[in-house]
Interface confidence: medium
């Protein structure tokens, strides 16, 4: 895992202000894991960041991600999660100035360094279709979700609302 100690130093001031011109309604520092309790980890390799899905050793520290929650003016194609047409969107940042991005052309999830305001590819609509798990739908490509494929994060097309409970697009958040 890379420089995660830096994420502990986040303050609201770093992430408030100008993202899409609004402030997040809240922020949450959490480790991200799959439905099957594999951890999402981040590693610096050849000056670029890689995202892995892996089993951690018992005492190995989990990487943390800062989730910033925003109101969206745009309802998702996948119905049923918004009240009055409003959705919650999140951005996910594992370290300062880097955010998860949806690369819809490559069907991949990547870490990009970028400045505010963040591009739409860094925003994901939050869904809660299965118990205490959440799913992340691309703002830029409705019906496409962050998922797990071959021990990496990838973009996965979900054809119907029943498939929103598919395990490979379900994630858990934890403070530990």
């Amino acid at each position: 895992a890379f420089g995660i100690s830096g994420v502990q130093k986040y303050t609201r001031a770093l992430h408030d202000s100008s993202i899409t011109g609004i402030s997040p309604i809240t922020e949450y520092l959490a480790s991200l894991s799959t439905y099957n309790d594999q951890s999402i980890t981040f590693a610096l390799e050849d000056e670029s960041y890689e995202i892995y899905v892996e089993d951690l050793k018992k005492d190995e520290k989990k990487d943390k991600v800062l989730l910033s929650y925003y109101e969206s003016q745009h309802p998702s194609n996948e119905s049923g999660d918004g009240v009055d047409g409003k959705m919650l969107m999140v951005t996910l940042s594992p370290t300062k100035d880097f955010w998860l991005h949806a690369n819809n052309k490559e069907h991949s999830v990547e870490l990009h360094k970028c400045e505010k305001p963040l591009p739409d590819q860094a925003f994901f609509v939050l869904h809660n279709m299965h118990s205490n798990c959440v799913s992340f739908e691309c703002k830029t490509d409705p019906g496409v979700f962050i998922g797990v494929k071959d021990n990496h994060l990838a973009l996965i097309k979900v054809d119907s609302s029943e498939n929103l409970c598919t395990e490979n697009i379900l994630f858990k958040l934890s403070e530990t």
């Epitope: 309604i25 109101e71 999660d81 009240v83 919650l88 118990s131 205490n132 403070e175």
Partner: nanobody, 124 residues
Framework: QVQLVESGGGLVQPGGSLRVSCAAS????????TGWFRQAPGKEREFVAS????????SYADSVKGRFSISRDSAKNTVYLQMNSLKPEDTADYYC?????????????????WGQGTQVTVSS
């Protein structure tokens, strides 16, 4: 911003029942969940029960399972905590809170909006 107003607290005898209510106003989302917490004098705030916005999943503290029930009236945007077989140790201020799904359900830090609380006293 979400505003939460609790009501329905009061004095009840051991073994009795009480229903407390939490009316929510402001902008709400289906990826929110509503929880009830309680705090007895001199003790830390503790989780009681939680319900997701579409009322499909509930969670209860072991100490209230089988006695308390959480429910929602979507038309009134109100969440209820029905408390049966009340015990003196249930005496506390009861707080309604709204959190975001996916965060640890029993932790107070998972909840971002809080009501002012309503007092429940169980005594003969």
């Amino acid at each position: 911003q979400v505003q939460l107003v609790e009501s329905g607290g009061g004095l009840v005898q051991p073994g009795g029942s009480l229903r407390v209510s939490c009316a929510a106003s402001g902008r709400t989302f289906n990826t929110f969940r509503t929880g009830w917490f309680r705090q007895a004098p001199g003790k830390e705030r503790e989780f009681v029960a939680s319900l997701n916005w579409s009322s499909t999943w509930t969670s209860y503290a072991d100490s209230v399972k089988g006695r308390f029930s959480i429910s929602r009236d979507s038309a009134k945007n109100t969440v209820y905590l029905q408390m049966n077989s009340l015990k003196p140790e249930d005496t506390a201020d009861y707080y309604c809170a709204v959190g975001i799904a996916g965060t640890p359900v029993m932790r107070a830090t998972s909840y971002i909006y809080w009501g002012q609380g309503t007092q429940v006293t169980v005594s003969s």
